[in-house]
């Protein structure tokens, strides 16, 4: 039975040209996290294997940096980066947990962080 929950940074906004940290945290389970994948819509941005480390997709290596922790840093943001991002936790023995973050990249300087929320 999957008992864990993923807490994410929720709906967030950031300024064009700036950076943003995408963060997820898995709690309420003793399952072993074996790998965390970061995806944007249908594209794989990065893999963080618990033993074998971080691997950034060549398509994103210039604008994506690993961390902090299991999070992901997006740099040099453009309005095209607006959209859904997913953290996918591969765990043993529970299976897969998925968290969702919506990022809006704004032209102006009115970007503010949204509230945290949980996905079971």
């Amino acid at each position: 039975m999957m008992t864990g929950t993923i807490e994410t940074t929720g709906n967030i906004s950031a300024e064009k040209g700036g950076s943003i940290i995408l963060q997820c945290h898995l709690s309420s389970t003793t399952a072993q996290v074996t790998q965390v994948n970061w995806e944007q819509q249908d594209q794989l941005l990065a893999i963080c294997n618990a033993d074998l480390g971080w691997h950034i997709s060549p398509s994103f290596k210039d604008r994506v940096a690993p961390g902090p922790g299991l999070g992901l840093t997006l740099q040099s943001l453009t309005v095209n980066d607006t959209g859904e991002y997913f953290c996918i936790y591969h765990t043993y023995p529970d299976g897969t947990y998925t968290g969702r973050i919506f990022l809006e990249v704004l032209e102006s300087s009115v970007a503010e962080h949204g509230a945290r929320f949980q996905i079971p």
Epitope: T34, Q35, N37, E39, D42, Q43, L44, I47, N49, A50, D51, L52, G53, H55, S57, P58, H90, Y92, T96
Partner: antibody, heavy 119, light 107 residues
């Protein structure tokens, strides 16, 4: 250049134990996660164990979980695989492997050590 | 676990031929795929990672492509030294699993 040299293979009876070693050189061993990959007589490849750079995290597939233990001695630049309760289906060539730097794939492999489980 | 199904199991072609090996994943692996070559009596050698990035020193006659569940390794002009077993591997989900292999022979 990166070199990985396995040893410790041999013939063992079902239910027996064996400890494989992999001597690493040519890179900073303590900075890299390491893996054991085996190739059975039908030439199928299977990743059987991984360990992080400091030895604090390990992973095993269900096929070997509870029977195999991966460990490392960073002072000796050596990777180990302790194999207990061996079965006929564990018969394989065992390779020590390392990912390339910034490479999602095993760029470095040893020459392998053969483990035969038979009565 | 994700199952990687390679085809064909054996491929016989002439020197200079264009050769294609396919790998089908049991679920979307989003380009987290690598390809290896194993010559007789040798250890596997990395050819391609992230589905299409050629590893250092790999001849440019080797190329990889694909997305979703379907991936391809192409040898644009088969050479005698390309006789080997070829394997795909997925890194999308643990355990990282390999395909069953394709044996490439010269006609």
């Amino acid at each position: 250049q990166v070199q990985l040299q396995e040893s410790g293979g041999g013939l063992v009876q079902p239910g027996g134990s064996l400890r494989l070693s992999c001597a690493a050189s040519g890179f900073t061993f303590s900075s890299y996660g390491m893996s054991w990959v085996r190739q059975n007589p039908d030439k199928r490849l299977e990743l059987v164990a991984t360990i992080n750079s400091n030895g604090g995290s390990t992973y095993y597939p269900d096929s070997v979980k509870g029977r195999f233990t991966i460990s490392r001695d960073n002072a000796k630049n050596t990777l180990y695989l302790q194999m207990n309760s061996l079965r006929a289906e564990d018969t394989a060539m065992y390779y020590c492997a390392r990912l390339g730097t910034g490479t999602l794939g095993f760029a470095y492999w040893g020459q392998g050590t053969l483990v035969t489980v038979s009565s | 676990d994700i199952v990687m199904t390679q085809s064909p199991k054996t491929l016989s072609a002439s020197v200079g031929d264009r050769v294609t090996i396919t790998c089908k994943a049991s679920q979307d692996v989003k380009t987290a795929v690598s390809w290896y070559q194993q010559k007789p009596g040798q250890s596997p050698k990395l050819l391609i990672y992230w589905a299409s990035t050629r590893h250092t020193g790999v001849p440019d006659r080797f190329s990889g492509s694909g997305s979703g569940t379907d991936y391809t390794l192409t040898i644009s002009s088969l050479q005698a030294e390309d006789v080997a077993l070829y394997y795909c591997q997925q890194h999308y989900s643990t355990p990282w699993t390999f395909g069953g292999g394709t044996k490439v022979e010269i006609k």
